[in-house]
Amino acid sequence: HSDGIFTDSYSRYRKQMAVKKYLAAVLGKRYKQRVKNK
């Protein structure tokens, strides 16, 4: 990595956390919908 240690920056970490949160919300919603449809 040409960025060296700076690849693990807080701004990148925050973006990853936001994506994880979004995916968890979407998957959770889908799961609830599936249970409801059953």
């Epitope: 960025d3 060296g4 240690i5 700076f6 693990d8 920056s9 807080y10 970490y13």
Partner: antibody
Framework: QSVEESGGRLVTPGTPLTLTCTVS????????MNWVRQAPGKGLEWIGI??????TYYAPWAKGRFTISKTSSTTVDLKMTSPTTEDTATYFC?????????WGPGTLVTVSS | AQVLTQTPSSVSAAVGGTVTINCQSS????????LSWYQQKPGQPPNFLIY???NLASGVPSRFKGSGSGTQFTLTISDLECDDAATYYC??????????FGGGTEVVVK
């Protein structure tokens, strides 16, 4: 996501000591991990860092005195090769490259004869 | 070696007041912005406040403000609260993959 240090204890001068940083909730394959120390009543002192590719970098004063290594996907070690009384401090592990955004509670190392 | 000089070493202000802490680096930090600020209370690890000179970390009140670039940086705490009494540290990340901390500033709230 958290980090925790372990291995701090009372050692005699010259006795090698290895501290361990255990991470949870993230992988070391995407993280840079630092060791920072703080002598009693003193300020923070950066020792060194291991990046996500296992490359290591040290403060000029720490070269040869400390060795940082990745020992598993969740642990990073700090080896103190030949501690002196001046190495008495709380040793912290912290995640981040160029900034330190997740800290452990620290582990106390006392070097005394 | 890179040196971070923090001034003053101690500062006192009343509740509701403002304090300013300066951090000067002997050479430019990475990208001119890799300067962060931390708050530490006795017996606790440091708490991450500000990253890349001026960005607030998650959960940090907007009373904390970071500014500066290159070699000169400032942390300003406004509307001081009793809970702000602590020691504050700046830290720099350098393009050589080396990092360092300032000497710390003790903030006393009267």
């Amino acid at each position: 996501q958290s980090v925790e240090e372990s291995g701090g204890r009372l050692v005699t001068p010259g006795t090698p000591l290895t501290l361990t940083c255990t991470v949870s909730g993230f992988s070391l394959s995407s993280a840079a991990m630092n060791w920072v120390r703080q002598a009693p009543g003193k300020g923070l002192e950066w020792i060194g860092i291991i990046d996500n590719t296992a490359g290591t970098y040290y403060a000029p004063w720490a070269k040869g005195r400390f060795t940082i290594s990745k020992t598993s996907s969740t642990t990073v070690d700090l080896k103190m090769t030949s501690p002196t009384t001046e190495d008495t401090a709380t040793y912290f592990c912290a995640r981040g490259g160029g900034e330190f955004f997740i800290w452990g509670p620290g582990t106390l190392v006392t070097v005394s004869s | 070696a890179q040196v971070l000089t923090q001034t003053p070493s101690s500062v006192s202000a009343a509740v509701g007041g403002t304090v300013t802490i300066n951090c000067q680096s002997s050479q430019s930090v990475h990208d001119g912005s890799y300067l962060s600020w931390y708050q530490q209370k006795p017996g606790q690890p440091p708490n991450f406040l500000i990253y890349q000179a001026s960005n607030l970390a998650s959960g940090v009140p907007s009373r904390f403000k970071g500014s500066g670039s290159g070699t000169q940086f400032t942390l300003t705490i406004s509307d001081l609260e009793c809970d702000d009494a602590a020691t504050y540290y700046c830290a720099g990340g350098y393009s050589s993959n080396i990092c360092g901390f300032g000497g710390g500033t003790e903030v006393v709230v009267k």
